[in-house]
């Protein structure tokens, strides 16, 4: 149940995909990844107001309980709904190889 | 890659399963759910310090970039890794039915 995509907080303030440029040094991968030296990391950032992109029933419950008990129950959180795969070129004991990752780059986002 | 389960912030402070008692009124379900009148909602609450229960490579990246750019990149968030199903007894147009929900109660938690 992917709920409303209208952000009541104003354009770009709610949960959505952002791109953050990161070097291998930033990621702590410099000693084992050869290429690329820079990754355009797509990640999910933004607020999750009531029913905005609610991933499922649990997210809807969380919204209701957060409204009632904000000190106990946190608001839903903006996280990846799916991922884009990526291939990195890595150093190995035997030389250089392609290493595939299915869960590295966010593809789209929801609130949960 | 499910990383360390030791919480550096002290017992019970990090991402874990909590149970929150909620009435149908709390959940906004009073007009369509007949039973149960009260739900023991299991949800994921707590901090996600560096590499604690990191769900995948994306969570590890997020930790690294949050450390570098805390104003831009949020810390990973404590969310369900899986769910327990639940059956509710509902009012329908034709009477009363059992309705199964697969995504209502968190079963275990991770950081993403």
């Amino acid at each position: 149940a992917r709920n409303g995509d209208h952000c009541p907080l104003g354009p770009g303030r709610c949960c959505r995909l952002h791109t953050v440029r990161a070097s291998l040094e930033d990621l702590g991968w410099a000693d084992w990844v050869l290429s690329p030296r820079e990754v355009q990391v797509t990640m999910c950032i933004g607020a999750c107001p009531s029913q905005f992109r609610a991933a499922n029933m649990h997210a809807q419950i969380k919204t209701s309980l957060h409204r009632l008990k904000p000190d106990t129950v946190p608001a839903p959180c903006c996280v990846p709904a799916s991922y884009n795969p990526m291939v990195l070129i890595q150093k190995t004991d035997t030389g250089v190889s392609l290493q595939t990752y299915d869960d590295l780059l966010a593809k789209d986002c929801h609130c949960i | 890659a499910r990383n360390g389960d030791h919480c550096p912030l002290g017992p019970g402070r990090c991402c874990r399963l909590h149970t929150v008692r909620a009435s149908l009124e709390d959940l906004g379900w009073a007009d369509w759910v007949l039973s149960p009148r009260e739900v023991q909602v299991t949800m994921c609450i707590g901090a996600c310090p560096s590499q604690f229960r990191a769900a995948n490579m994306h969570a590890q990246i997020k930790t690294s970039l949050h450390r570098l750019k805390p104003d831009t990149v949020p810390a990973p968030c404590c969310v369900p890794a899986s769910y327990n199903p639940m059956v509710l007894i509902q009012k329908t147009d034709t009477g009363v039915s059992l309705q199964t929900y697969d995504d209502l109660l968190a079963k275990d938690c991770h950081c993403i």
Partner: antibody, heavy 120, light 107 residues
């Protein structure tokens, strides 16, 4: 925008050596590796190898091992492919291609190609 | 090495037609397949990576699907500028290998 510009056509005799250049612009040269691919007249595409400008690490196709050398010059953002002991079946268009930003084993954008003709 | 087999080797079609090209890998490559378009005298152009992800700037009439060993490139409504040769390429392991190509010709 990202651009790869290759050196001009070459005619070589069997046994000679050719060195093709590929000048990159529009991005940080040592952030992405360069692949080399060739295409014989009327034929399909054949991957030759890969080099990362950052460290100089290379991977070569086994059939070319010992005859091919890939290098880079970071000061001029240029990649080079040298092929030795040329034979007539090395006649081909030689392409350089950058790793795609999304995944290192997809190729794009590409250079315009360099025709190398091996003939006695 | 992983062998890539493309079919058909050529296809005759008209503007507006739906065209499907298939590519089979000799062993499982998960989703690590790319598709390229090449016009005569020009360099190949990346259309699709990771089996189904459309490269930026590529028209949405191109789509890719498949995983494991069997993959498909579909052009939903062929345009005049789409007459070209199409290649698949596996990106799961070195050496990278290409299919033999499929020439899309005007009927």
């Amino acid at each position: 925008q990202v651009q790869l510009v290759q050196s001009g056509a070459e005619v070589k005799k069997p046994g000679a050596t050719v060195k093709v250049s590929c000048k990159a612009s529009g991005y940080t040269f040592d952030s992405y590796g360069i692949h080399w691919v060739r295409q014989a007249p009327g034929q399909g595409l054949e991957w030759m190898g890969w080099i990362t400008a950052y460290s100089g690490d290379t991977v070569y196709a086994q059939k070319l091992q010992g005859r091919v050398t890939m290098t880079t010059d970071t000061s001029t953002s240029t990649a080079y492919m040298e092929l030795r002991s040329l034979r007539s079946d090395d006649t081909a268009v030689y392409y350089c291609a950058r790793e795609s930003g999304q995944t290192s084993s997809a190729l794009g954008p590409w250079g315009q190609g360099t025709l190398v003709t091996v003939s006695s | 090495d992983i062998q890539m087999t493309q079919s058909p080797s050529s296809v005759s079609a008209s503007v507006g037609d739906r065209v499907t090209i298939t590519c089979r890998a000799s062993q499982g490559i998960s989703r690590w397949l790319a598709w390229y378009q090449q016009k005569p005298g020009k360099a190949p152009k990346l259309l699709i990576y990771a089996a189904s992800s459309l490269q930026s700037g590529v028209p949405s009439r191109f789509s890719g699907s498949g995983s494991g060993t069997d993959f498909t490139l579909t052009i939903s409504s062929l345009q005049p500028e789409d007459f070209a040769t199409y290649y698949c390429q596996q990106g799961a392991s070195f050496p990278l290998t290409f299919g033999g190509g499929t020439k899309v010709e005007i009927k």
